[in-house]
């Protein structure tokens, strides 16, 4: 239904706390360089204005769209051009072009320092002094670094953050309590960020239909007892919600997400038997719980998929007359039978089925042509299964850090033109798939591995798109979203690459490496490894192992030395010389 004042409507629906959080996220995602203080001032102005509209929907400007109101606020910021350059040009445009322009200027890799967690004591002090401000800073810092983070989910993580601090700041050993708990929240939030970026990429590049297909597959796996009409309704709603969030309509997105949770909880009987525990929770937790819900049990009496999609005489007629419904039904039926497949794989199978019908239906004997289509799925299913098997075996053998290094070597060979920081980030994230997925039961491994890898590779594509350097990466990234992972897996050593000259300074280290946290130390070593591969793309595994082992020993030795600086200065050149020799 239409409301006189959209901003009043959203304020009333969401409540002041969530309203303010979402407005802060929106501003932080649009203007990523502005300090917290500047954004919070705007948030307060918008909130005060919303309250006047709640009091009187006919008040001046209350009838304006939220994009218009937010855009006007952003465009009124002094020195916008000085800080944001051409983003200021957006302000010359009218809505909806202005908002589109803001979206195009979102930076997936903003030049911001990594978010440093303060010491436990300092954190607790500032949290206890002003919890609202503390959590506001959290929303701001995460949102500006992740401009596509799913806003209602970020509110949930802020709530989690709040819970952890409330609990741990009363403990005697605050750090021991905080560190593992906040690490867990951070890990979940980072995965959520790449997953949502992939959803927005899907929406931006391939439109709503592609996203809806993803949603149908996912919902069908989770709710195999729900009817197709129910799954379609849920998928349509989820598509709308994600479109809104990806498009910067965060208030509408959060409001609609809460509505969907309400709908699901009111219709548990026709959706899933697993929802009840979620439905007793408050709104943010309820939505999050529903988004992470375990799969319902598959109905016992499902007939063979072949009956309706191969043996039925009307297959071609049904396909030609309503592809969306017929192929949607195929995707639903196949997905509800296969919670053990990744969504990417299910979409590839649906695409293969569609392509087969498109090829066969006009022929003289269509059933003879498409009759073996289900058997032709086998190689498509085997490929990711083998990927999971070989990678999990490698992970079990090497551990997370060793596995990351193996992935780093592989990807540097595939795309040596890509910047070393991007390769290291991608390899570290890809390498985490082992810890995340390989320990799961067999039936959960494939969906976990492939859908996670797809999201990480999407991040690589997004970064590469900004400054394209590798034709191979461009080719994999510009194809269909579901084909990306197989495309990257199939890449081999780039034979066109001219090896980088050996620069001693790239492999020169100083005593500062000794005081770095383990993670930073690993990154330094992995940076050196990528540079080695760029210098010698065809180096054997043994050669790289020798050099990296030598390097680790060198760092270890010098960090234990009495005169660290002297050790690095004298031993460093020897290491460089030995490395050059080992790789010759």
């Amino acid at each position: 239904e239409a409301h006189k004042s959209e901003i009043a409507h959203r304020f009333k629906d969401l409540g002041e706390q969530h309203f303010k959080g979402l407005v802060l996220i929106a501003f932080s995602q649009y203007l990523q360089k502005c300090p917290y203080e500047e954004h919070i001032k705007l948030v307060q102005e918008v909130t005060d204005f919303a309250k006047t509209c709640v009091a009187d929907e006919n008040a001046e400007n209350c009838d304006k769209s939220i994009h218009t109101l937010f855009g006007d606020k952003l465009c009124a910021i002094p020195k916008l051009r000085d800080n944001y350059g051409e983003l200021a040009d957006c302000c010359a445009k009218q809505e909806p072009e202005r908002n589109e322009c803001f979206l195009q200027h979102k930076d997936d890799n903003p030049n911001l320092p990594p978010f440093q967690r303060p010491e436990a004591e300092a954190m607790c002090t500032s949290f206890q002094e002003n919890p609202t401000s503390f959590l506001g800073h959290y929303l701001h810092e995460v949102a500006r670094r992740h401009p596509y983070f799913y806003a209602p989910e970020l509110l949930y993580y802020a709530e989690k953050y709040n819970e952890v601090l409330t609990q741990c700041c009363t403990e005697s050993d605050k750090a021991a309590c905080l560190t593992p708990k906040l690490d867990a929240v951070k890990e979940k939030a980072l995965v959520a960020a790449v997953r949502q970026r992939m959803k927005c990429s899907s929406m931006q590049r391939f439109g709503e239909r592609a996203f809806k297909a993803w949603a149908v597959a996912r919902m069908s796996q989770r709710f195999p007892n729900a009817e197709f009409a129910e799954i379609t309704k849920l998928a349509t709603d989820v598509t709308k919600i994600n479109k809104e969030c990806c498009h910067g309509d965060l208030l509408e997105c959060a409001d609609d997400r809460a509505e969907l949770a309400k709908y699901m909880c009111e219709n548990q009987a026709t959706i899933s038997s697993k929802l009840q525990a979620c439905c007793d929770k408050p709104v943010l937790q309820k939505s999050q719980c529903l988004a992470e819900i375990e799969h319902d049990n598959i109905p016992a009496d499902l007939p063979s998929i072949a009956a309706d999609f191969v043996e039925d005489k009307e297959v071609c007629k049904n396909y030609a007359e309503a592809k969306d419904v017929f192929l949607g039904t195929f995707l639903y039926e196949y997905s509800r039978r296969h919670p053990d497949y990744s969504v990417s794989l299910l979409l590839r199978l649906a695409k293969k089925y569609e392509a087969t019908l498109e090829k066969c239906c006009a022929e003289g004997d269509p059933p003879a042509c498409y009759g073996t289509v289900l058997a032709e799925f086998q190689p498509l299913v085997e490929e990711p299964k083998n990927l999971v098997k070989t990678n999990c075996e490698l992970y079990e053998k090497l551990g997370e850090y060793g596995f990351q290094n193996a992935v780093l070597v592989r990807y540097t060979q595939k795309a040596p033109q890509v910047s070393t920081p991007t390769l290291v980030e991608a390899a570290r994230n890809l390498g985490r798939v082992g810890t995340k997925c390989c320990t799961l039961p067999e039936a959960q491994r494939l969906p976990c591995v492939e859908d996670y890898l797809s999201a990480i590779l999407n991040r690589l594509c997004v970064l590469h798109e900004k400054t394209p350097v590798s034709e191979k990466v461009t080719k994999c990234c510009s194809g269909s979203l579901v084909e990306r992972r197989p495309c990257f897996s199939a890449l081999t050593v780039d034979e066109t690459y001219v090896p980088k000259e050996f620069k001693a300074e790239t492999f020169t280290f100083h005593s500062d490496i000794c005081t770095l946290p383990d993670k930073e130390k690993q990154i330094k070593k992995q940076t050196a490894l990528a540079e080695l591969v760029k210098h010698k793309p065809k180096a054997t595994e043994d050669q790289l192992k020798t050099v990296m082992g030598d390097f680790a020993q060198f760092v270890d030795k010098c960090c234990k030395a009495a005169d660290k600086d002297n050790c690095f200065a004298t031993e460093g050149p020897n290491l460089v010389a030995r490395s050059k020799e080992a790789l010759a």
């Epitope: 439109g207 396909y319 019908l357 239906c361 003289g364 269509p366």
Partner: antibody, heavy 119, light 110 residues
């Protein structure tokens, strides 16, 4: 050489009927889909319908009921009933690119036959 | 209702010019089922591009198709004398019965 050749056009009175033929040579018709497309004088192209190799037919929403497509081993037909002045057009038959069934990719066309509906 | 809007309806250009024709579809076409045809007076149309961007065999590389979903473009990078003609886009949808052509764009000599 592959050829599609339409015939059967001419002057017909409003309310009348006409059957157009599309003779296909140089290919085995039993493996291809054939479409009918029309073009009113000075106007754009308008898809009428398709017949698959199996004989299954589909029509544009506006064409259902008045137009019927059929085929034999070498010829595809378009039966047009209850003709109106606005049906005046050049009628083409065209082959769908092999490997496609429902896509609007027509690689071989006849030269067209003019149908004039007038009293 | 399916609407396929081609623009401009006509364009005057000279040999060597770059010409761009757009085709907007509502709703979006199915699976990039979008084709471009060239038609000269008194002749049947000729398929230039299918699947939005694939060139039919024998079609010169100065013809380029791009786009996806609802917005598509045909670009002729350097117009040749034989390119003066009318161009049509054709779209396929969820239902084959909705197969539609755009209104056409006439490329004339300036």
């Amino acid at each position: 050489e592959v050829q599609l050749l339409e015939s059967g056009g001419g002057l017909v009175q409003p309310g009348g009927s006409l059957r157009l033929s599309c003779a296909v040579s140089g290919i085995d018709l039993s493996n291809y889909a054939i479409n009918w497309v029309r073009q009113a004088p000075g106007k754009g192209l308008e898809w009428i319908g398709i017949i698959w190799a199996s004989g299954t037919t589909f029509y544009a929403t506006w064409a259902k009921g008045r137009f019927t497509i059929s085929r034999d081993s070498t010829t595809v037909y378009l039966q047009m009933n209850s003709l109106r002045a606005e049906d005046t057009a050049v009628y083409y038959c065209a082959r769908t690119v092999p490997g496609y069934s429902t896509a609007p990719y027509f690689d071989l066309w006849g030269q067209g036959t003019l149908v004039t509906v007038s009293s | 209702d399916i609407v396929m809007t081609q623009s401009p309806s006509s364009v005057s250009a000279s040999v060597g010019d770059r010409v761009t024709i757009t085709c907007q579809s509502s709703p979006s076409v199915w699976s990039n089922f979008l084709s471009w045809y060239q038609q000269k007076p008194g002749k049947a149309p000729k398929l230039l591009i299918y699947e939005a961007s694939k060139l039919t065999s024998g079609v010169p590389s100065r013809f380029k198709g791009s786009g996806s979903g609802t917005d598509f473009t045909l670009t002729i990078s350097s117009l040749q004398p034989e390119d003066f003609a009318t161009y049509y886009c054709g779209g396929g949808y969820s239902s084959i019965s909705d197969t539609t052509f755009g209104g056409g764009t006439k490329v004339e000599i300036k």
